[in-house]
Interface confidence: low
């Protein structure tokens, strides 16, 4: 490998470098490619250098683009026409120049927040680009059509939101604002300019009209309508609160739609239960008055007892089922009919008949085993499957099994 | 501090009866959903059955569903679980236990258990 | 039904992942010592009831949730359970039993 590579000038872009060449193993070293390493890197990275090739013959080169106020340490790899040499040992650790900063925070954006604020976020700057020591941003703001920008300095190179307060600031206003940079060497550039709006009001009137009806043992649908006066705070979407009879309204569950959808399903609730229901609409600022409560029962859980006996004989193409019908409990809902479900063997998508009798017939290809299971459906849902029956490939025309 | 002390275990034989009972004291029994859960020798746990604080829903798996009954005194601060057909895989250890919340998310959140008091069905 | 790995082991002070597949509207964990009653460590997918150390959380995504020990302990070592409920049964996964090496 090249001997250990010295850094004989540095500016904040820059550094000029010079090495001693190595041993070249009887084959003369074509090239040399210099490599950089900071603390922000990953690794050894090929750099840009003047001369952009470095002949084999060179032991100088000027390492160019680096960014300013980081330190640096660098080592040269020959090459030669048997292939890629060791790398020379590491150089020193170097810091460039400072500068001033050139880019600017990603993401400048904001809102929400409390009564009579504007709030305003951003990325900050990543180190290894703040080019300098006292790094800091700006941040500029003003009503949207306004001419005279209000600048706030903030003196912390991780500060990434500043909150204006004040009680000119009316609610969901939208202000223009841009955030830049600064370090010990001076101001950079300023962001693009972006509109923010102004913290809003939450909702001021309940949603009308809630309507809720139970779907089965374990669902329920709730309606409602948009609140029929003007609100004064923007409606994100609604929060739906639920919670059984007999307990408290302090432990209801919630769940929120978003935007302006107008119902809502509420699963995984419990069988033949008194629920109550109340609706609030919803925005950045808080939740507003909740609408009048509704009530609803889930009907009935599905039956729990599954087919039995089931029975399948085949003829032709077609396979006869049949099997014994179920019967509910005092606290289910009534068997409504049943859904036969059947799929080849290998095939994953399922197939369903629908029946009010318990008996059905399928007609079905002969060259295919078919997994086959039967379970009672209801007002309450579906109710428990039967063991899946697997039905072997038939050659002969006449077969029949339990 | 919330206590479940259950009793009335014991050895039974197939197709008897038998009757558990769970004393409650430390918080307010009429508030929360409350459970049995067993769990048969070496083997995992099982929900039972749950009973709503008022005691107007009860839940139960299906393999005690037509057999076992769950039912609650609140007057008496007391659980019951009434057992009947009994079959030697019913043998297992009964737990008695509270939901955390008088909101139940069901086996999501029985926060207090009994010691359990052990049904061994067997001729 | 929920499905669990019948058993995990873990080395001292590592970190741990458990899961447990099947639906549910809400999922708890239980931590079951020899001889002893369960205890709740997680409710409703995320919660930790007081007094349970804050290496023990939980997370749900889909169909699976997951109980997390970051820095298992030698105490740690039980069998853990999954719990939930789906319409109207409530059920229990297989168990799980961790080992701490």
């Known amino acids: 490998p090249p001997e250990a590579v010295t850094i004989d000038e540095i500016t904040d872009t820059t550094a000029q470098l010079s090495w001693r060449p190595g041993p070249d193993n009887h084959s003369p070293i074509t090239m040399y490619v210099i490599q950089a390493r900071t603390p922000f890197s990953v690794g050894w990275q090929a750099v840009s250098t003047v001369p952009e090739l470095i002949d084999g013959k060179t032991f100088t080169a000027t390492v160019v683009g680096l960014n300013p106020w980081v330190e640096y340490e660098f080592r040269t790899v020959a090459a030669n026409v048997i292939g890629i040499g060791e790398p020379s040992r590491p150089s020193e650790k170097r810091r460039t120049e400072e500068a001033l900063p050139e880019v600017t925070p990603a993401n400048v954006s904001g809102g929400g927040g409390s009564k009579s604020e504007l709030v305003i976020t951003w990325e900050t700057v990543p180190e290894e680009l703040q080019n300098g020591r006292g790094f800091g941003y700006v941040v500029a703001f003003r009503p949207y059509g306004k001419m005279i920008w209000m600048l706030t300095v903030l003196a912390s190179a991780d500060a990434s939101r500043y909150v204006f307060r004040n009680e000119s600031v009316h609610p969901f206003s939208p202000f223009e604002v841009k955030v830049g940079v600064f370090n010990n060497k001076g101001e950079g550039p300023f962001s693009p300019t972006t509109v923010v709006y102004s913290a809003e009001e939450e909702p001021t009137k309940p949603p009308a009209s809630i309507f809720a009806r139970s779907l089965s043992a374990t669902d329920i649908e709730v309606f409602w309508a948009s609140p029929l006066e003007k609100n004064r705070g923007r409606i994100q979407g609604y929060e739906v609160k639920y919670w059984r009879h007999e307990d408290k309204e302090e432990n209801a569950r919630k769940i929120r739609t978003v935007g302006n959808q107008t119902s809502t399903k509420i699963t995984n609730l419990k069988g033949s239960v008194l629920y109550h229901l109340a609706v609030k609409a919803y925005n950045s600022a808080g939740t507003g008055p909740s609408s009048a409560t509704v009530n609803v029962t889930t009907r009935k859980p599905p039956p729990s007892q599954p087919p039995g006996n089931i029975i399948w004989n085949s003829s032709d193409s077609k396979i006869i089922l049949n099997w014994d019908q179920v019967k509910a409990l005092d606290n289910e809902s009534e068997v409504k009919g049943y859904k036969v479900l059947y799929r080849w063997n290998r095939q994953s998508s399922t197939s369903v008949i629908e029946t009010n009798k318990t008996s059905v017939e399928l007609s079905l290809p002969f060259d295919e085993d078919y997994i086959i299971e039967i379970k009672p459906f209801s007002d309450g849902g579906d109710g428990s499957s039967s063991e899946q029956i697997r039905i072997p490939k038939i050659s002969n025309a006449y077969a029949r099994g339990s | 501090e919330v206590q479940l002390l259950e009793s009335g275990g014991g050895l039974v034989q197939p197709g008897g009866s038998l009757r558990l009972s769970c004393a409650a004291s430390g918080f307010t029994f009429s508030s929360f959903n409350m459970f049995w859960v067993r769990q048969a020798p070496g083997k995992g746990l099982e929900w039972v059955a749950e009973?709503?604080?008022?005691?107007?829903?009860?839940w139960y798996a299906p393999a005690v569903k037509g057999r076992f009954t769950i039912s609650r005194d609140n007057s008496k601060n007391t659980l019951y679980l009434q057992m009947n057909s009994l079959r030697a895989e019913d043998t297992a250890v009964y737990y008695c236990a509270k939901s955390a919340f008088t909101w139940s998310y069901g086996a999501a959140s029985i926060q207090a258990w009994g010691q359990g008091t052990l049904v061994t069905v067997s001729s | 039904e929920l499905t669990q790995d019948p058993a995990v082991s873990v080395a001292l002070g590592q970190t741990v992942r458990i899961t447990c597949s099947g639906s549910?509207?809400?999922y708890g964990w239980y931590q079951q010592k020899p001889g002893q009653a369960p205890v709740l460590v997680i409710y409703d997918n995320t919660n930790r009831p007081s007094g349970i150390p804050d290496r023990f959380s939980g997370s749900s995504s889909g169909n699976t949730a997951s109980l997390t020990i970051t820095g298992a302990q030698a105490e740690d070592e039980a069998d853990y359970y999954c719990?939930?409920?789906?319409?109207?049964?409530?059920?229990f996964g297989g168990g799980t039993k961790l080992t701490v090496l």
């Open positions: 009973i709503s604080g008022g005691g107007g829903s009860t």
């Open positions: 549910s509207g809400s």
């Open positions: 719990g939930g409920y789906w319409g109207s049964t409530d059920v």
